[in-house]
């Protein structure tokens, strides 16, 4: 027989946690497991429950999380790793919208998110969307380009930046920007 | 909010002995490794004793073996690090630090804690 079944490992309330602010992570695997090993990679860290609660979030606790599980004498397969962000390391950016916020729909936006520090790295979200886009840009600014656009692109978005030597130490959010399609 | 206070330093006598004690406040104690670390003036903080929330298994630095002694009493959210022997190299700020998780290395790193307190002043006069 082979390995078990790899478990789920998710954060509540969001993998993105503002600094001493509290997240919980979870790995749930089937019922009945004997053990939970739950991981912080590139770092001797683990413990052996399936919850970690995170009281306040600190900078030491951002990076790649994966759980597995125990049943007798075999192991699970790792979950997906989970990264855990610190928010908050760093100031703002700012969000703008070239032409403008308002666009019609079947035309072009580019957002751009902009810093006055080195960051090479950026992350757009769209409030609702389970994942950011992320873009790197050597000069500070990073372009989101949204071409063909549909009423799908409306929303609230936010931006934030961050330096690839240390990937998950994010800035604050940038101010919300509204796009509107008409 | 998590909270880490020390207390019990001062000015004590080469050979004089201190009780720090490090109360915890805003997380499930039991659940979390304890060390203390201190740092001298002009030199990087170091690790001087843990001890895990499992087990209650203990590290002691090398230069304090036989000498100091590291206690935790999950019911007062309390750790205390009992000091013998005390040198006057070991004039130094003594900080308690928590750790949610586990760490499987053999000796305190600062790395592997992520919540701190202000510190204690010690000072051992000749």
């Known amino acids: 027989s082979g390995p078990l079944p790899k478990p789920s490992l998710q954060a509540l309330p969001s993998s993105l946690v503002p600094l001493e602010k509290p997240v919980t992570l979870r790995c749930q695997g089937p019922p009945g497991v004997d053990l939970y090993r739950l991981e912080k990679l590139s770092s001797s860290r683990y413990q052996d429950q399936a919850v970690l609660f995170i009281p306040a979030m600190k900078r030491s606790l951002a990076g790649r999380y994966r759980c597995s599980y125990q049943n007798g004498s075999l192991w699970s397969l790792p979950s997906d790793q989970l990264e855990l962000v610190a928010t908050g390391v760093f100031a703002k950016p700012s969000l703008s919208a070239q032409p403008g916020p308002a666009v019609s729909s079947g035309g072009d936006v580019t957002l751009q998110c902009q810093t006055r520090y080195g960051f090479d790295q950026f992350a757009l979200y769209k409030e609702g969307d389970p994942a950011p886009y992320k873009n790197p840009e050597r000069w500070y600014r990073a372009s989101f380009p949204i071409i063909t656009v549909t009423a799908a692109h409306s929303g609230t978005y936010r931006c934030y930046s961050f330096s690839s030597r240390d990937p998950y130490l994010w800035s604050a959010p940038s101010d919300p920007l509204e796009l509107v399609v008409t | 909010q998590v909270q880490l206070q020390e207390s019990g330093g001062g000015l004590v006598q080469a050979g004089g002995s201190l009780r720090l004690s490090c109360a915890a406040s805003g997380f499930t104690f039991d659940d979390y490794a304890i060390g203390w670390f201190r740092q001298a003036p002009g030199k990087e903080r170091e690790g001087v004793s843990c001890i895990s929330s499992s087990d209650g298994s203990t590290y002691y630095a090398d230069s304090v073996k036989g000498r100091f002694t590291i206690a935790r009493d999950n019911a007062k959210n309390t750790v205390y690090l009992q000091m013998n022997s005390l040198k006057p190299e070991e004039t130094a700020v003594y900080y308690c630090?928590?750790?949610?998780?586990?760490?499987?290395?053999?000796?305190?790193?600062?790395?592997?804690?992520?919540?701190w307190g202000q510190g204690t002043q010690v000072t051992v006069s000749s």
């Open positions: 630090a928590a750790s949610p998780l586990y760490y499987s290395g053999s000796y305190c790193r600062e790395t592997e804690y992520d919540y």
